[in-house]
Interface confidence: low
């Protein structure tokens, strides 16, 4: 029921032991008594007792204090129970009766006779109050007090609104005096069913099953589930939604894998030489003479420049070298003769011209020749005049450079960027990396080239089924699906068969 | 309107097995808490089972726990109940209920129920 009408009779006096026909009983009145609750009535009619009717067991003879009781026969407050809103207004008869026969079972025995009745009608609110009053006549006077109280989950002024305490997966909360609910920390919603997941946790990226608690959805991080994800094997780049690489300031590539400025980072080139970035590995290095090597990092020998002139052979030494001149030239190159013209000193048709009043000579040799006595053989190669590995090529009296691709110049010290064409589309940046360009696409638009105008939002159609979530941009369809526990297909259309054991967890 | 209609129900022998399915029509199936209650003769309604709309979640009476298995199909707007090792107690008419969201799961917070299917259990 919704709550209880509670009488508590206090005290009966019947001094004289008479019934309320004039007799007396005989050896004295046995007084147990009958309640009757009902609608309220302003005359107070037979009839059914619509609110509910109890009796007592004999509670003493002629007059007698009532003791409360809370079990068993005889309990004092009498309970009226009703399974209703109460309505706020009552009638009420209470009568004494003498009985001959059964304590414990007076409405039972026959002989029974009434002593006194008293009727009370009027308006009643719930509440913990007790009303007292005391009822007179001729012979006998009543002392009594009653109340209404809601039942256990029942709250409001009529005892209408109905409410468990609980904390369950149903709902997790207390009853206000109300009968509205009041949550317990942690959990908030119309039935306290929703957790409050951890401060800060993000709204659309994270979730929760209990409360301070935040759980990711697919492609956040962090413990705010704040933090994207970049693509998997994104090296040097970030991402501002999930699965996105967008490099880092110097970074190329699908992976951000590809050093645009390895020179500056790196500083690959050794012993003054210049590095530029271009090349197969993303940087060359331009070696000072006297070095060699991918890196500049091999000194070559002393004698590599050929620093001996006129013939004379070289000898490395520990920081130096040595000339070995030949008969007729001295000096630390062997710069300095000797000879004379008349000495025939110039080879392979040179002309000899006198200089220092005869006393030393000068070659000028014909094409193709060189050196002091034009006893060289022009390799215009040897100087090695062709950068970014460039191949170098006698052609007569002159060289030239056939350069590697994406190469140009005389020396091939000029790099064709194949940005320079501006391949990229719609705005796009380009990149220059070994394999050719690689254009970084603004929002909108996709392809090697930017090419592609992204017309619609895949996802927008809401192609994936049974509460997957859509992304777009990671597959040629240009969606994927990904499905919830329970659920697979490119679409999470086929549901997986369901493992006996339960609850799951969210 | 949502329409439920249960099927699956029969006479088992104690120790079997029977499937139980509700398919509901109308408005989007996928939003809405699915449960299955029970009512044997002369007794009240009681709760068997509840899942949540992403199927993520499901709940069981003690009485019921670890026999019985609540799941759900959103592309078939099927709810179901697996019932194991069925006991004579299990006898009753099983009802299919579901409910709005943000509602607790609860018999009467559900928003519709269906007619019912007979199980019963003999020894």
């Known amino acids: 029921g919704s709550g209880i009408f509670q009488l508590r009779l206090q005290e009966f006096v019947n001094q004289r032991g008479m019934l309320a026909n004039g007799q007396s009983c005989e050896p004295g009145c046995r007084t147990f008594f009958r309640i009757c609750l009902k609608h309220f009535q302003a005359t107070f009619s037979e009839g059914p007792c619509t609110f509910g009717n109890v009796s007592t067991p004999v509670l003493g003879t002629n007059s007698f204090v009532v003791r409360d009781k809370n079990s068993g026969s005889g309990r004092n407050p009498l309970q009226l129970p009703f399974n209703f809103t109460w309505p706020g207004t009552f009638s009420l008869n209470i009568q004494a009766w003498h009985t001959p026969g059964d304590d414990l079972r007076p409405e039972t025995s026959p002989g029974n006779s009434l002593i006194s009745q008293i009727i009370i009608q009027g308006s009643l609110a719930v509440g913990k109050i007790w009303r007292t009053d005391e009822q007179n006549d001729t012979l006998t006077r009543l002392s009594y007090s009653y109340r209404v109280i809601c039942s256990d989950n029942y709250y409001g002024e009529s005892c209408s609104r109905l409410c468990k305490k609980r904390d369950d997966h149903f709902g997790h909360y207390e009853c206000q005096p109300d009968g509205s609910l009041s949550c317990l920390p942690g959990w908030t919603g119309k039935y306290c069913d929703q957790p409050i997941c951890l401060s800060g946790c993000h709204e659309q990226n994270g979730y929760c099953s209990k409360p301070d608690e935040c759980i990711c959805r697919p492609g956040w991080q962090g413990r705010l589930c704040n933090e994207c994800i970049p693509h998997n094997g994104c090296r040097h780049g970030t991402c501002s939604i999930p699965w996105q690489c967008a490099c880092d300031e110097g970074w190329g590539g699908l992976f951000c894998d590809q050093d645009l400025n390895y020179c500056t980072h790196h500083s690959p080139c050794k012993n003054g030489s210049t590095c530029s970035n271009s090349g197969p590995k993303g940087y060359t290095c331009t070696c000072l003479p006297g070095y060699t090597g991918e890196h500049c990092e091999l000194g070559l020998s002393k004698c590599a420049s050929n620093p001996c002139r006129n013939g004379g052979s070289c000898k490395d030494q520990e920081n130096s070298y040595h000339c070995l001149c030949p008969p007729g030239y001295y000096g630390q190159h062997c710069e300095h003769s000797t000879l004379t013209c008349a000495d025939s000193p110039c080879f392979n048709g040179g002309s000899c011209r006198e200089r220092n009043q005869g006393s030393s000579y000068a070659c000028e040799c014909p094409p193709n020749f060189t050196g002091s006595n034009c006893e060289k053989k022009v390799d215009r190669c040897t100087s090695n005049p062709c950068a970014n590995g460039g191949q170098c090529q006698n052609r007569g009296p002159s060289r030239t450079c056939r350069c590697r691709p994406g190469f140009t110049g005389t020396h091939c010290e000029l790099h064709i960027s194949d940005c320079a064409r501006s391949p990229c589309a719609h705005g796009g940046t380009c990149h220059d990396l070994e394999n050719g360009p690689v254009c970084t696409c603004p929002a909108g638009f996709s392809g090697r080239r930017c090419e592609v105008r992204i017309t619609h939002d895949a996802c927008a159609s809401g192609p994936c089924f049974n509460g997957a979530t859509c992304y777009t941009g990671l597959s040629p369809n240009n969606f994927v699906c990904n499905c919830p526990y329970g659920f697979v297909g490119s679409r999470c259309e086929f549901p997986v068969g369901l493992p006996p054991s339960f609850p799951w967890v969210a | 309107e949502v329409q439920l209609v249960e099927s699956g129900g029969g006479l088992v022998q104690a120790g079997g097995s029977l499937r139980l399915s509700c398919a509901a029509s109308g408005r989007t199936f996928s939003s809405y808490a699915m449960a299955w209650y029970r009512q044997a003769p002369g007794k009240e309604r009681e709760y068997v089972a509840a899942i949540r709309w992403s199927g993520g979640t499901a709940y069981y009476a003690d009485s019921v726990q670890s026999r019985f298995t609540i799941s759900r199909d959103n592309a078939k707007n099927t709810v179901y109940l697996q019932m194991n090792s069925l006991k004579p107690e299990d006898t009753a008419v099983y009802y299919c209920?579901?409910?709005?969201?943000?509602?607790?799961?609860?018999?009467?917070?559900?928003?519709?129920w269906g007619q019912g299917t007979q199980v019963t259990v003999s020894s």
């Open positions: 209920a579901n409910r709005a969201p943000d509602t607790r799961l609860e018999p009467y917070e559900y928003d519709h």
